[in-house]
């Protein structure tokens, strides 16, 4: 029961996490520029991985996509790649984990197969979460190291004078969404891996001694229904009948006088 709960909770946590990673990737507020005041209107500038937006105090908002790939910073491309890899891995992990859920019966799927699928999805969730955390952290590092900060400069040339005002970008909401979502996906993955250990069938190697009445030459050997990983002598989970009772460790030996009561 605890295994099912752990697996189910891991799935739900990962599902929320991946939904968060998708949301963060699509969000425009990865970085926000400090409020830019001017004599006309307050302008709020913010950027995402795919487009840049400007909002005026009047409420007017304009967003434009990055239609070029060549002019984009390599770091931005790397962040995009990490987030997409995280989403893809997470989506595959979700698909695998659905079939791995203990509460869902699909044909005659054995527990060992479900355990393997649970472990696979768990690893996928962990990698997915790490990708998201890495992507968000790389972007945050760009902001911290003043990648977005323009240096105050003024020069004259063709077309006049440009004054690049000291404006600074700060962390946008998407970064926090990404960190939390990545963390949740990571936790969900760990839970799935823990659940996998409980799902994996273990060999219960008891010394099974069978008894039968002296008037009969057939002995019932208990232990036929024990959990097996295929390493024991009774891999087919059948009732074993033979001429005398034997322990599991004495399958090859002949009956002796000690076998009978």
């Amino acid at each position: 029961m605890a295994v099912t709960a752990c697996q189910g909770l891991g799935f739900v946590v990962s599902l929320i996490g991946i939904a968060g990673i998708i949301a963060a990737t699509c969000m425009d507020q990865w970085s926000t520029q400090d409020l830019y005041n001017n004599p006309v209107t307050a302008v709020f500038n913010y950027q995402g991985l795919w487009r840049s937006c400007v909002r005026e105090s009047s409420g007017f908002t304009e967003c434009r996509g990055y239609f070029t790939l060549l002019g984009l910073p390599a770091m931005l491309q790397a962040v995009r790649a990490l987030m997409i890899v995280g989403i893809v891995l997470g989506a595959i992990g979700l698909l695998v984990s659905i079939f791995a859920l203990k509460c869902i019966r699909i044909g005659s799927m054995e527990d060992s197969a479900k355990a393997n699928m649970t472990l696979t999805s768990g690893i996928m969730f962990i990698v997915s979460g790490l990708c998201a955390i890495a992507g968000v952290s790389v972007f945050a590092n760009m902001l911290v190291t003043n990648f977005w900060m323009s240096t105050a400069n003024m020069y004259t040339g063709m077309g006049g004078m440009v004054q690049t005002v000291q404006t600074r970008y700060t962390f946008g909401a998407a970064l926090f969404v990404g960190w939390v979502a990545g963390g949740l996906t990571l936790i969900g993955g760990v839970m799935m891996c823990i659940a996998c250990r409980g799902l994996a069938p273990e060999e219960t190697n008891y010394k099974a001694v069978s008894y039968h009445a002296s008037g009969h030459s057939v002995a019932y050997k208990p232990g036929g229904f024990k959990a097996s990983t295929g390493f024991g002598s009774n891999t087919k989970n059948k009732k074993i009948y033979d001429g005398g009772a034997r322990t599991e460790d004495e399958v090859q030996s002949y009956p002796s006088k000690h076998d009978y009561v």
Partner: nanobody, 121 residues
Framework: QVQLVESGGGLVQPGGSLRLSCAAS????????MTWYRQALGKEREFVAG???????NYADSVKGRFTISRDNSKNTLYLQMNSLRAEDTAVYYC???????????????WGQGTLVTVSS
């Protein structure tokens, strides 16, 4: 980079009219706000009028009712219609744009070289 080129300045009699233009060119990603400033000889640069892409406009008290600012977003061009000109309107008029040359770059202040408007009889 974003280049701004002003035109339309010249000599005009008091009470006359002029229309200034400012054309933005270059690697423009977005220009949220465009403004006109002026600087008279020996004085500090002062705000005249400005307009945002959303249509919000603002005027200095000294030009209200006389000057009209407009912009053509499709052409990235700013206009200033100046009526009932006075001698104190004599100055070099500068075009200013708060723009980003690339989407991931911060908004920056870009300035034109200015156009001279002389109001004299």
């Amino acid at each position: 980079q974003v280049q701004l080129v002003e035109s339309g300045g010249g000599l005009v009699q008091p009470g006359g009219s002029l229309r200034l233009s400012c054309a933005a060119s270059g690697s423009i990603f977005s220009i949220p706000v465009m403004t006109w400033y002026r600087q008279a000889l020996g004085k500090e640069r002062e705000f005249v009028a400005g307009i945002s892409k959303g249509g919000t406009s603002n005027y200095a008290d000294s030009v209200k009712g006389r000057f009209t600012i407009s912009r053509d977003n499709s052409k990235n061009t700013l206009y200033l219609q100046m009526n009932s000109l006075r001698a104190e309107d004599t100055a070099v008029y500068y075009c200013n744009a708060q723009a980003s040359s690339f989407g991931w770059m911060p908004l920056s202040d870009y300035w034109g070289q200015g156009t001279l408007v002389t109001v004299s009889s």
